[in-house]
């Protein structure tokens, strides 16, 4: 089964949330696709997509968010400029495939955005997330209204326990591994 | 031991496939996505794709679009890439490499294998 | 695709001198550059990453600098084991592409 992780970013005020998330080329290259936010006991709500059929690498910017979706590599990259503390959340990326139910991708990201400074994150054994930090880089489409209840989730729990959903296999798994913290002044 | 390990020289006839094994020991083989590369003799590097363990998606560019197909066994941490129709333009140095976390736009290649070299010849 | 033009193509210097190499993108790549050594007969190591980062375990005699088309690659002081051709490489855009590599050698 494919492993549904959390992973999570620590970055500070005014720093560049750079993702991507990966579909399968075959199906879901011209779909439209968005990036959510999932906030605990809400429906996931939408904050930008891509037109609709989805334009190769063809930027759209919502506000400060910013989606490029390369369908000849199957990825979509989301990037999030000037992040403020209040941007902190658990995001995620899906596909819009009506009159089904949004295809909802790998992995979530867990983002937590601080004033100033943070030091670097520790390696914690018991962690269910990734924890790293990234360094700053520096047309708006129509979205769907519907949100299906199906993608409605709680942030995945902080123990290894399985975390199930109605037609998939997903299993939360202990992912310890840091990433490499580049610094930049 | 963090590494990657890959199979052996190939020799191979022009219209025929490869299929080039890339082993990897030392990490979290799901966490890291496997790039290919390839270097003809003399030749600069040159990107073909990538493969997210973890889902089993793949991109490739388009150079190599309906002739390479990426695919890898999490059981046995091992990623593979299989080129079809070869040519003996295709003769390189193939070389597996992780990239980097599989939800991060991070591109750089911190572990690489040693190459498997190809050779093709009528 | 973007363009990676590196320069010189190839370059000899003595022990102890101070080795440039020039990296020149086709459009703005945001500092998302990497530089790769590679040995004859090796895979190619990577030694900076986004610009100016060095990789663990990479001596500091290496450096790397600059922003949006323009990066610089340094040696501060040649040694032997430099031998190499060394390579940049930018991802703000797929496909990833490469320069065409700086051979350097001692004179």
């Known amino acids: 089964a494919t492993k549904l992780t959390e992973e999570k970013y620590e970055l500070k005020e005014g720093q560049t949330l750079d993702v991507k998330c990966d579909y399968t080329l075959e199906k879901f290259a011209s779909s439209q696709k968005a990036w959510q936010i999932i906030r605990d006991g809400e429906m996931p709500k939408t904050l930008a997509c891509t037109e609709r059929p989805s334009k190769n690498s063809h930027p759209v910017q919502v506000g400060r968010i910013i989606l490029e979706d390369y369908h000849d590599h199957g990825l979509l990259r989301v990037r999030m400029v000037n992040l403020q503390v209040e941007d902190s959340g658990l995001y995620q990326c899906v596909i819009y495939q009506p009159p089904k139910e949004p295809h909802m991708l790998f992995d979530r990201i867990r983002l937590v955005v601080t004033k100033g400074f943070s030091g670097t994150p520790g390696s914690n054994e018991n962690s269910t997330q990734n924890v790293y930090k990234i360094p700053p880089t520096t047309t708006k489409a129509l979205c769907p209204l519907y949100t299906s209840p199906r993608t409605v989730t709680q942030a995945p729990p902080k123990s290894t326990a399985d975390v199930s959903t109605p037609d998939s296999e997903i299993n939360l798994t202990n992912v310890t591994d840091i990433i490499r913290v580049p610094v930049f002044n | 031991q963090v590494q990657l390990v890959q199979s052996g020289a190939e020799v191979k006839k022009p219209g025929a496939s490869v299929k080039v094994s890339c082993k990897a020991s030392?990490?979290?083989?799901?966490?890291?996505?496997i790039n290919w590369v390839r270097q003809a003799t003399g030749q600069g590097l040159e990107w073909m794709g990538w493969?997210?363990?973890?889902?089993?998606?793949?991109g490739q560019t388009q150079k190599f679009r309906g002739r390479v197909t990426m695919t890898r066994n999490t059981s046995i941490n091992t990623a593979y890439m299989e080129l079809s129709s070869l040519r003996s333009e295709d003769t390189a140095v193939y070389y597996c490499a992780r990239g980097g976390y599989t939800s991060a736009w991070r591109w750089y290649f911190d572990l690489w294998g040693r190459g498997t070299l190809v050779t093709v010849s009528s | 695709d973007i363009q990676m033009t590196q320069s010189p193509s190839s370059l000899s210097a003595s022990v102890g001198d101070r080795v440039t190499i020039t990296c020149q993108a086709s459009?703005?790549?945001?500092?998302?550059l990497n530089w790769y050594q590679q040995k004859p007969g090796k895979a190619p190591k990577l030694l900076i990453y986004?610009?100016?980062n060095l990789e663990t375990g990479v001596p500091s005699s290496f450096s790397g600098s600059g922003c949006g088309t323009d990066f610089t690659f340094t040696i501060s002081s040649l040694q032997p084991e430099d031998i190499a051709t060394y390579f940049c490489?930018?991802?703000?855009?797929?496909?990833?592409?490469f320069g065409g590599g700086t051979k350097v050698e001692i004179e």
């Open positions: 493969l997210n363990p973890n889902s089993g998606n793949t």
């Open positions: 986004d610009v100016s």
């Open positions: 490489q930018q991802y703000d855009k797929l496909p990833l592409t």
């Open positions: 030392g990490y979290t083989f799901t966490r890291y996505d």
């Open positions: 459009q703005d790549i945001n500092n998302h």
